[in-house]
Interface confidence: low
């Protein structure tokens, strides 16, 4: 899916508003710098590819995000201000349903919400896409985003 | 205990518009998206649009789009569904519903209970 | 956009039989909701993503079905199930089915 036509103001708001802070609730009890940012993003739309995959792809390790309340609220969002993503999603949800069949916290899902969390920051602090670029504008960036 | 009520009956005039309201209580209203959805007499539902109360972030069904309006007051935890250019056709009970995100699909899981709306001349 | 078919358009039954009801989508979609409706009053929601009961609905109602064919099943009619029965899909905005009506035989 390419999130470049993206309501990216709304999905922002729908972040600061209650995905952040459900993030952080699944996150409680493990200090801020228990994990290293290996995961990072250019701009908008990339940050939104990053942040689908990490969320709803099941990985070894951790196959039960996409049942988490950050998740589902992250899933809304994109439904609702992404054109046409609910329909890219079919299959991946049919396949995330086979995968969940328990809500494990296993510390492998502790490093990825991590990871997210700083997807997150970045989408909603997009400056520098690379060096010597100048600060980040939405117009701008419909030319640098990545297809995946 | 999750309530949606609306508003009264409305008897409109063609070209005229309408204002339902639906006041939400027992959750924090801008926390949960809110559908509005028609049925018109003997019809099936009819999904018109969806609200993100926290923002104002809207969707709309195409066929509705342009003159249906969806707003909300947060500090009243009310959504409103505007309806202009009203016809025969427009005669319809309207329901709120609100989204929750429990269940995969975000199902409507509160509705209110609904406000019927006659447009005749 | 998504066109659900129910079928049958009616059905006609008598207490403590078993109703089968079709939700037919014109294309794929991930899950299904059901609702019931009786007159006057608003839709209530029965299954959640095809095959969750609702909170307070009986275990004589299930769902099942995937890609474009999904099924509600009441295993013993009682007379307070008599009524309009709607799908609705999610996948693509929100679209729901013409109803199906079980009445009394």
């Known amino acids: 899916y390419d999130f470049t036509n993206c309501d990216f103001e709304k999905i922002k708001a729908a972040y600061l508003s209650t995905i952040s802070k459900d993030l952080i609730t699944y996150m409680s009890g493990t200090k801020s710098t228990e994990f290293n940012n290996t995961v990072s993003c250019s701009n908008r739309p990339h940050c939104l590819t990053e942040i689908q995959s990490l969320t709803f792809n099941p990985t070894a390790g951790c196959a039960s995000l996409a049942k988490e309340m950050f998740a589902m609220k992250t899933k809304a969002a994109l439904a609702i201000w992404c054109p046409g993503y609910s329909e890219t999603q079919i299959n991946a949800t049919q396949a995330m349903k086979k995968a969940r069949k328990s809500k494990v916290t296993t510390n492998k899902c502790l490093e990825q919400v991590s990871q997210l969390q700083g997807l997150w920051r970045r989408f909603n602090r997009p400056l520098l896409k690379q060096q010597g670029s100048s600060d980040y504008k939405d117009d701008d960036d419909k030319h640098h985003h990545h297809h995946h | 205990e999750v309530q949606l009520v609306q508003s009264g009956a409305e008897v409109k005039k063609p070209g005229a518009s309408v204002k339902v309201s639906c006041k939400a209580s027992?959750?924090?209203?801008?926390?949960?998206?809110m559908n509005w959805v028609k049925q018109a007499p003997g019809q099936r539902l009819e999904w018109i649009g969806i609200i993100s109360p926290y923002n104002g972030g809207t969707s709309y069904n195409q066929k509705f789009k342009g003159r249906a309006t969806l707003t909300v007051d947060k500090s009243a935890s009310t959504a409103y569904m505007e309806l202009s250019s009203l016809r025969s056709e427009d005669t319809a009970v309207y329901y709120c519903?609100?989204?929750?995100?429990?269940?995969?699909?975000?199902?409507?899981?509160?509705w209110g209970q609904g406000t019927t709306v006659t447009v005749s001349s | 956009e998504i066109v659900l078919t129910q079928s049958p358009a009616t059905l006609s039954l008598s207490p403590g039989e078993r109703a089968t009801l079709s939700c037919r989508a014109s294309s794929s979609v991930s899950y299904m909701h059901w609702y019931q409706q009786k007159p006057g009053q608003a839709p209530r929601p029965l299954i959640y993503?095809?095959?969750n009961l609702a909170s307070g609905i009986p275990a004589r109602f299930s769902g099942s079905g995937s890609g474009t064919d999904y099924t509600l099943t009441i295993s013993r009619l009682e007379p307070e199930d008599f009524a309009v029965y709607y799908c609705?899909?999610?996948?693509?905005?929100?679209?729901f089915g013409g109803g199906t009506k079980v009445e009394i035989k």
């Open positions: 993503a095809t095959s």
């Open positions: 519903a609100r989204e929750d995100y429990d269940y995969d699909g975000y199902a409507m899981d509160h």
């Open positions: 609705q899909q999610w996948s693509s905005n929100r679209t």
């Open positions: 027992g959750y924090t209203f801008t926390d949960d998206y």
